[in-house]
Every structure is written in C-alpha cells, then in structure tokens.
Interface confidence: low
C-alpha cells in the first residue's frame, strides 16, 4: 500500500503527521496499511529470448501526481546487488537511458515497460525494479520484489571449417555415388541392347521382276 514518503523540504517527520492518511485508509478499508513505501509490482519470473532479450513491466501505485520519475533496475545475485541501469523521465515523455546502457524502456502512466538486452546465462538473477518519485515533493520510494530472469545460452554453432569438411565429404560422396550409379545403369543398358546390334545387312533379289532395280534390305540376326 502506498502512503507518505519522507519529505525533502518539510523536514518534520513525527509519526502523527506522517500516518494520518494511512489511519484514514485503515478505517475506510479495514486493512492494515504500512506507511513506508510506494507499492511496486513486477512479474515473478521472465525467460529471456534465445537472443538474450528479456522484457518485463514495472508498475507503481503513485500516491501523488509526480512529474519526474526515476526508474532503476538492480540485479541481485549471490547476495550482491548491482545497478544494471537507471533512467529519469518526465511523465508523458520517453525513458532515456545512457547510450551504452543495456536497457531500453517506454512509459505509459504508472507503468514502465523495461527491456534488457545482451543477456547471457551468467546474467541469470533477480532483477529488482526501484521507482523514485523525484518531483514535486514529497519524495517517494518503492522497491519491487524482483523478477527472476532466466537466461539460457543457445547451443554454440559448430566450427565453420568443420562444416566445410562435412559439406565437402557429403558432396564428394554424392558425386561418386551418382557416378557409380550412372556407370552401372549404362552397363545394364548396353547389355540389354546387345542382340539388336550384332547382325549383317544382305542384298536380297527382288521377288517381282518389274522392281528389278529396287533392293529391300533384310536383317538377318546372327546367333
């Protein structure tokens, strides 16, 4: 639940003045309200794509009308917390991360769509979304429970030289196979045609006298 954060300019922070909105909410809603933070929601688990890109939504329940918001992505792994990226944006404008940042993002109302790229298996961890309402006062801070991002490295491609050898071997094999097949086929064809090609042509006398000058060849097969 979101209540009051601590104020930068109004320094007096006694409990009575800080918690009356919560007390009011308590009586209105009959639920316990803790006045320490602004609520930040984010998905529990996200699986990065094969190209090492992970996207998730970071949503915060803004208690006031903030005009300047700072979003920070923290990575927690092995009890160490490191800052992944951070961006400050004016409400209604785009998020601008540093040029060398691995993060990109867009904002829509109280939602921030974050994309982290260039992830590898070793980057698997809990990615925490931290939201700060910077301006106008009071200053609010909210920290999400974190999104566990799993990154699985794609199977490495075999060596290009090795691939060339495989390609050469396969194509050579196919060539010799086709050559052999052609040779066998030709030999079989020749064997089948052999009775038709062994014979002599002889001149036969005409059967009719008027066709004296016309000779019809007749084929005599020789066994």
């Amino acid at each position: 639940m979101a209540c009051l954060g601590f104020q930068r300019h109004k320094a007096q922070l006694n409990l009575a003045t800080r918690t009356w909105p919560c007390t009011l909410l308590f009586f209105l809603l009959f639920i316990p309200v803790f006045c320490k933070a602004m609520h930040v929601a984010q998905p529990a688990v996200v699986l990065a794509s094969s190209r090492g890109i992970a996207s998730f939504v970071c949503e915060y329940a803004s208690p006031g009308k903030a005009t300047e918001v700072r979003v920070t992505v923290l990575r927690q792994a092995d009890s160490q917390v490191t800052e992944v990226c951070a961006a400050t944006y004016m409400m209604g404008n785009e998020l601008t991360f540093l040029d060398d940042s691995i993060c990109t993002g867009t904002s829509s109302g109280n939602q921030v769509n974050l994309t982290i790229q260039g992830l590898r298996a070793m980057d698997t961890g809990l990615y925490i979304c931290k939201v700060e309402l910077m301006y106008p006062p009071p200053y609010y801070l909210g920290i999400g429970n974190g999104t566990q991002i799993y990154v699985i490295d794609p199977e490495p491609c075999p060596d290009s030289d090795f691939l060339l050898w495989i390609l050469a071997a396969v194509s050579s094999g196919l060539f010799f196979y086709s050559f052999l097949l052609t040779a066998v086929s030709l030999s079989k064809m020749l064997k089948k045609r052999s009775p038709l090609t062994t014979g002599v042509y002889v001149k036969m006398p005409p059967t009719e006298p008027e066709c004296e000058k016309q000779f019809q060849p007749y084929f005599i097969p020789i066994n």
Epitope: F6, L13, K36, Y139
Partner: nanobody
C-alpha cells in the same frame, strides 16, 4: 527539525582508536538506515559503515577495524574505530536514509551514492578525524 550531530573526532596516532557518535532527532529512528561516510581532501565521499533493522555493512577498507552500533532508545549511532591508519584521515559524516534500502535486501547498497543518501538523505555537519603517522 531533523538533525544529525556528529561528535568524537580528533587527532590520533596511527594504530590508535576513536569512537564517533551520531545523535539523530526529528524523525522516527526505526524508519531509517544510518550510515557513516567519509570524505578525504580531493576525494569523493564514500560509505564506511551502515546500520539498519536489516543488519550492518562495512566497506572492505575498514572491515575488522571499525564497528558500528546503535542505541535506539537514545537515537544514537556509534562508530568504534580501532587500528587507525593515516589513510583513514577524513571528515566523517553521519547520514540517514529510508530503511527500505536495508542491508537485508541490499547488502552494502544503501551505503552507496546511488541509493538515496546524496539526493534525499539527511546529513550531519561532519567531524574531522586526523591520523598521524
């Protein structure tokens, strides 16, 4: 009025000890993480040690030599500095920031500049610690 008042600084020989105190007032002590920071001439302010409901944090350079503790009833945080070295010479500041950035969730995190102290924390005026060789 929020106030953080440091005391206990001074001149000490290398190998000596000092105990710094930070008295806080004007806010609910339990809601904040209190840290000790130092700034040597020409250098950036750095986190030395922090304490919150989640636990304690020490910079690598002071581990085993400095001890942070608190007396919640008196809203006071102490920094016991033993085996002091000349490189510990600096102005020591006491800072307070929302304990949401607790050691429990962010080990050492709330002692760094990125976690709210510098822009939104409360600061004392500082106390000079000089270690002579």
């Amino acid at each position: 009025q929020v106030q953080l008042v440091e005391s206990g600084g001074g001149l000490v020989q290398a190998g000596g000890s000092l105990r710094l105190s930070c008295a806080a007032s004007g806010f609910t002590f339990d809601d904040y993480a209190i840290g000790w920071f130092r700034q040597a001439p020409g250098k950036e302010r750095e986190g030395v040690s922090c304490i919150s409901s989640g636990g304690t944090y020490y910079a690598d350079s002071v581990k085993g030599r400095f001890t942070i503790s608190s007396d919640n009833a008196k809203n006071t945080v102490f920094l016991q500095m033993n085996s002091l070295k000349p490189e510990d010479t600096a102005v020591y500041y006491c800072g307070a920031v929302s304990s949401l950035l607790s050691v429990e969730r962010f080990p050492g995190g709330h002692c760094g500049p990125r976690y709210g102290y510098y822009r939104h924390g409360y600061w004392g005026q500082g106390t000079q610690v000089t270690v002579s060789s």
